[in-house]
């Protein structure tokens, strides 16, 4: 069992969904779990989040906000073998840019 490389970071806008892949070469029913190292608190043990969503072990986090920031790590286990762990993907949550003042309808501009 071995893991493919995962992206070092993922940038997602506030309120959007984050999709994390956990690519591995297991042909069997591998058990994928996801863990998070909290942003700004790297001395804590990783936090257990739960299983992946599909046979590929994708993690989907809906409606992300700033508190979702951190490093997301997947672990893959086949049977009772020791798990393999990804290097982790750092989730950056981006504030959407403010709407420009001039970005308004023609009707509003002409008032």
């Amino acid at each position: 069992l071995w893991m493919h490389k995962v992206p070092a970071s993922l940038m997602v806008s506030l309120g959007e969904d984050a999709h994390f892949q956990c690519p591995h070469n297991s042909s069997n029913n591998a058990n994928v779990t996801w863990w998070r190292v909290l942003h700004g608190n790297y001395t804590w043990p990783p936090e257990f989040l739960g299983p992946g969503e599909d046979p590929n072990g994708t993690l989907i986090i809906q409606n992300v906000n700033k508190s979702h920031g951190g490093i997301y790590v997947c672990r893959v286990q086949e049977g009772n073998e020791s798990y393999q762990q990804s290097c982790g993907t750092y989730l950056r949550v981006r504030q959407p840019p403010p709407r420009p003042f001039l970005d308004m309808g023609e009707g509003t501009k002409n008032r």
């Epitope: 739960g50 299983p51 969503e53």
Partner: antibody, heavy 116, light 111 residues
């Protein structure tokens, strides 16, 4: 502070239905797989059902498979358990819980009584 | 999904040490070491005492310790105190988002 608040319990007749809710606050709810765990009067803890963070994966104990449905509304930070075809042996306190690791959170539970 | 096996009851005098065992199969425990121990007083929700087999959450007394060897996990309470009298449950991750609990052990502190 993390809070999980269950509601919806009560007295129901055998064969009846009930829907439990669990309102979560103080945690990044959408990140976590969530679970329902129950405890019959004077008995031990029994895992009932689990759901992945986005709701794409659902899991059930054999004792409730086909009768109970777990779901979640991530826009409301709420977990649900729809319980149909209830039996006397489903009588228990039902806890909503995030299990595993140091971020392990439980509600105070809601009592479901199935009796005629 | 059979329950993990725990002794129904254990007892000890104040100041003594007791150990509660929790036995399962290799598929119950896997290699993730996601084994937790809970303390439950009557009418209360379970309280996490040990996570990942041997780690103590902040706020839990260092009189509580956990270990795991093969398919058996153990909880040891040293320097027994009256307030330790409660029910204790082990719990293990069993893949997907499924969990298995032990049948529970009633701890009596003899006075």
């Amino acid at each position: 502070e993390v809070q999980l608040l269950e509601s919806g319990g009560g007295l129901v007749q055998p064969g009846g239905s009930l829907r439990l809710s669990c309102a979560a606050s103080g945690l990044t709810f959408t990140s976590y797989a969530m679970n329902w765990v129950r405890q019959a009067p004077g008995k031990g803890l029994e895992w009932v059902s689990g759901i992945s963070g986005s709701g794409g994966g659902t899991y059930y104990a054999d004792s409730v498979k086909g009768r109970f449905t777990i779901s979640r509304d991530n826009s409301k930070n709420t977990l649900y358990l729809q319980m149909n075809s209830l039996r006397a042996e489903d009588t228990a306190v039902y806890y909503c819980a995030k299990l595993g690791g140091w971020s392990d959170y439980w509600g105070q539970g809601t009592l479901v009584t199935v009796s005629s | 999904q059979s329950a993990l096996t725990q002794p129904a009851s254990v007892s000890g005098s104040p100041g003594q040490s007791i150990t509660i065992s929790c036995t399962g199969t290799s598929s119950d425990f896997g290699s993730y070491n996601l084994v937790s121990w809970y303390q439950q007083h009557p009418g209360k929700a379970p309280k996490l005492m040990i996570y990942e087999g041997s780690k103590r959450p902040s706020g839990v007394s260092n009189r509580f310790s956990g270990s795991k060897s093969g398919n058996t996990a153990s909880l040891t309470i040293s320097g027994l105190q009256a307030e330790d009298e409660a029910d204790y449950y082990c719990c293990s991750y069993a893949g997907g988002s499924t969990w298995v609990f032990g049948g529970g052990t009633k701890l009596t502190v003899l006075t």
